[in-house]
């Protein structure tokens, strides 16, 4: 029977800069029941605080609700593991909420095959930003990435869409059923999970175009950019 091993705070994430959660990995338990507590202070303070909510984020977590989340403040936190034989402390972790944002996936992904009479057919997709993110405040710039693949293919084809919430693709295999997903990330922060897959059947008479892909601006009727495969590769974010 031994004191507990050193825990490690391995991740902190915020969906929207208004709340955040941190998770830790326990060290060895020393063969005894072990209690964990997270304490923190803000940089510039010596007032020590305890985790306000050990429940919301699941096991080995601390959730900071709205009233505990301050923008422009760096949190200095550590986890204490205690059993009957003694205690051990994690290293201090410095957390600035601005840099730990991981949004929810984009919503309402719509995918359609467009076949205008006067132009080549294309795949058109549209989505909405996650509801927790308020883009109107100017706190956020969200960047989007799309991936798609034929249902039975192993490899995804990925396209960076910038800040647009609409996208066009010309190069597709006729007669194939495609899976399409979208994800987002703030300018400082982490990519969201991919949205649930949307399926689209490409008609057999869809005209193939391997040379170019077309990316539209916000308004499909507005200016459009023709982007080569080489340029597109330059925009990839993985």
């Amino acid at each position: 029977q031994l004191p507990p091993g050193k825990p490690e705070i391995f991740k902190c994430r915020s969906p929207n800069k208004e709340t955040f959660t941190c998770w830790w990995r326990p060290g060895t338990d020393g063969g005894l029941p072990t209690n964990y507590s997270l304490t923190y202070h803000r940089e510039g303070e010596t007032l020590m605080h305890e985790c306000p909510d050990y429940i919301t984020g699941g096991p080995n977590s601390c959730h900071f609700g709205k009233q505990y989340t301050s923008m422009w403040r760096t949190y200095v936190m550590m986890v204490n593991a205690t059993n009957q034989m003694g205690s051990s402390f994690s290293d201090e972790l410095y957390v600035d909420v601005t840099y730990i944002v991981q949004p929810d996936p984009p919503l309402e992904l719509t995918v359609e095959v467009k076949q205008p009479e006067d132009r080549k057919p294309y795949l058109w997709m549209k989505w909405s930003p996650p509801t927790l993110i308020d883009l109107k405040t100017g706190w956020f710039t969200l960047l989007y990435e799309i991936r798609l693949k034929p249902e039975k293919a192993a490899e995804w084809e990925t396209h960076f869409a910038g800040q647009q919430t609409e996208f066009k693709i010309l190069s597709l295999h006729p007669g194939q059923k495609y899976l399409v997903q979208v994800r987002c990330k703030p300018d400082h922060g982490y990519w969201s999970a991919w949205s649930p897959a949307t399926f689209i059947q490409i008609p057999s008479d869809f005209i193939m175009n391997d040379e170019q892909k077309l990316i539209s601006e916000e308004d499909l009727g507005g200016e459009q950019k023709l982007i080569s495969e080489e340029d597109l590769h330059h925009h990839h974010h993985h």
């Epitope: 303070e45 010596t46 020590m48 306000p52 900071f64």
Partner: antibody, heavy 118, light 107 residues
Framework: EVQLVESGGGLVQPGGSLRLSCAAS????????MNWVRQAPGKGLEWISY????????YYADSIKGRFTIYRDNARNSLYLQMNSLRAEDTAIYYC???????????WGQGTMVTVSS | DIQMTQSPSSLSASVGDRVTITCRAS??????LAWYQQKPGKVPKLLIY???TLQSGVPSRFSGGGSGTDFTLTISSLQPEDVATYYC?????????FGGGTKVEIK
């Protein structure tokens, strides 16, 4: 409605003891850090004690250290102040106050009067 | 311990006047400073925190400023309902010291 209600004040002789209680309602008491602040008649506010949400961190003002004990019972949504070795200068209204997430006193009780006199 | 000194200890001004109260910390406290208002016979009420952030529901005639050691609370146009004692308080470390208070009266 978010509310703090103090009780337990009264007249006590110097050297005596008293226990103040603060009953919380309308919010998740166990998530908040709590404090006692007092105000002597005609005087200013004096912070005297702090307790973290689970009771693991406690601070006292020098004026009460070793004589007063702060503790809490989250199951009962209650905060307490055990006051021993009371002195005349401890005469005051005692307020319990909730510490918000940004460390300011956002909710106050109505106060309970403690008079130490022979 | 860090001391908080308020000045003046009392003041009298006319309705509509601009009133400024000063609070000085004996050491730098960044902007970990709050202002409270206590009306006669009432419980203290939070006005401002982080030196300049107005608490929800507080009239916009109240404003706070300063950082480090010197802070101010300003009432841009004094109203009869502003008669009260105003306290500054630092909250970056224990003890969570209050200033001595400034009593504001109407002429």
């Amino acid at each position: 409605e978010v509310q703090l209600v103090e009780s337990g004040g009264g007249l006590v002789q110097p050297g005596g003891s008293l226990r103040l209680s603060c009953a919380a309602s309308g919010f998740t008491f166990s998530s908040y850090e709590m404090n006692w602040v007092r105000q002597a008649p005609g005087k200013g506010l004096e912070w005297i004690s702090y307790i973290s949400s689970r009771g693991g961190t406690i601070y006292y003002a020098d004026s009460i250290k070793g004589r007063f004990t702060i503790y809490r019972d989250n199951a009962r949504n209650s905060l307490y102040l055990q006051m021993n070795s009371l002195r005349a200068e401890d005469t005051a209204i005692y307020y319990c106050a909730r510490l918000s997430g940004v460390d300011i006193f956002d909710i106050w009780g109505q106060g309970t009067m403690v008079t130490v006199s022979s | 311990d860090i001391q908080m000194t308020q000045s003046p200890s009392s003041l009298s001004a006319s309705v509509g006047d601009r009133v400024t109260i000063t609070c000085r910390a004996s050491q730098g406290i960044s902007n970990y400073l709050a202002w409270y208002q206590q009306k006669p016979g009432k419980v203290p009420k939070l006005l401002i925190y982080f030196a300049s952030t107005l608490q929800s529901g507080v009239p916009s005639r109240f404003s706070g400023g300063g950082s480090g050691t010197d802070f101010t609370l300003t009432i841009s146009s004094l109203q009869p309902e502003d008669v009260a004692t105003y306290y500054c308080q630092r909250y970056n470390s224990a003890p969570l010291t209050f200033g001595g208070g400034t009593k504001v009266e109407i002429k």
